[in-house]
Amino acid sequence: ELCDDDPPEIPHATFKAMAYKEGTMLNCECKRGFRRIKSGSLYMLCTGNSSHSSWDNQCQCTSSATRNTTKQVTPQPEEQKERKTTEMQSPMQPVDQASLPGHCREPPPWENEATERIYHFVVGQMVYYQCVQGYRALHRGPAESVCKMTHGKTRWTQPQLICTGEMETSQFPGEEKPQASPEGRPESETSCLVTTTDFQIQTEMAATMETSIFTTEYQ
């Protein structure tokens, strides 16, 4: 039931899960200079019954130089800022997503956690995509991917999000003008963005939904 591959990558976009299906594993990884305590868990596991799901096991890191175990503490804000994940962290979870039966919320950080979280997803898991800072959605089709089982093999559906750093002549409703591309655009740009004013309620809803889902952007 574990998904064979990672969710697909989208150019100039990042993804995150809003909630994690039961069976999801999160590796207990420590940052450089730290290691898992000797008797510590290899991973956290999302488990539960019909009414409640939670993460089993606790991740604990200790200094590689010492043999003392560290206590579980929540990092201070400046420590937390250092953390960077493949699946963008979001301090606010939409209630309808995080409260899904059979799903766990984002696990709280542990002391000296590695900068990137490695999840092992299960069939049925959904992740959501958003363009990184400096890029905007040219096309915002279904911006999610689901791990599905077909013919005995798992595969992630392809998100239909196209992120562009092209200069624009008008904006999506509810979106700020993008900042300069983090990668920088060459002078001799070889494609041009043309926009029209044919914006629909659907677009506005997508923009609103996107804002509510992704409260923090990580690149």
């Epitope: 096309h139 915002r140 392809q158």
Partner: antibody, heavy 115, light 107 residues
């Protein structure tokens, strides 16, 4: 099943314009962007541009900038590609292709530019 | 633009052969690469997307690998219907460019 059906072959004089249509069916049209690709006789594939089927935003390859216009009509689930100021080197088969990975293609529209 | 270079440009092989076509990008494109098959007078058909994912309905004898700048399309055991022209294409950034094509012919 998913289908992209393009308009029929066109013969045009140099300097004229041509408008090719691509009607999508069997899926939610506005979920997938539409790309346009052309292929000159005996040549490879050339990407012309992409249009968002829900917003009408488009990005064109620099080579076609100022000559190409891509539009969509959501009510009929149809994408259009208009190329103006035609020259003989625009003689090609023009394809529409769906989505991020070009997973479905139209059957192609042959455009011949000849005096 | 990102240039996509395929090799070889043409290839002769026999039914049952294992065939490999390579595609090189002029800069890192991660895994944002597709492979298409085109037969004369027909539209291209998606074979592989995101460098290694087999498109729906494509036989498992086709496989893709690679990341960054170097990519490979492999046909494990050539079938008569596989003789065609193959193209790679990136979707890292616009303009999305194609390789020049590899024509696979019967030996």
């Amino acid at each position: 099943q998913v289908q992209l059906v393009q308009s029929g072959a066109e013969v045009k004089k140099p300097g004229a314009s041509v408008k090719v249509s691509c009607k999508g069916s069997g899926y939610t049209f506005t979920d997938y962007a539409m790309h346009w690709v052309r292929q000159a006789p005996g040549q490879g594939l050339e990407w012309m541009g992409v249009i968002s089927t829900y917003s009408g935003d488009a990005i064109y390859a620099q080579k076609f900038q100022g000559r190409v216009t891509m539009t969509v009509d959501k009510s009929t689930s149809t994408a259009y590609m208009e190329l103006s100021s035609l020259r003989s080197e625009d003689t090609a088969v023009y394809y529409c292709a769906r989505g991020v990975t070009f997973d479905y293609w139209g059957q192609g529209t042959t455009v011949t530019v000849s005096s | 633009d990102i240039q996509m270079t395929q090799s070889p440009s043409s290839l002769s092989a026999s039914v049952g052969d294992r065939v490999t076509i390579t595609c090189r990008a002029s800069q890192d494109i991660s895994n944002y690469l597709e492979w298409y098959q085109q037969k004369p007078g027909k539209a291209p058909k998606l074979l592989i997307y995101n460098a290694k994912t087999l498109a729906e309905g494509v036989p498992s004898r086709f496989s893709g690998s690679g990341s960054g700048t170097d990519f490979t399309l492999t046909i494990s055991s050539l079938q008569p219907e596989d003789f065609a022209t193959y193209y790679c294409q990136h979707h890292y950034d616009t303009p999305y460019t194609f390789g020049q094509g590899t024509k696979l012919e019967i030996k």
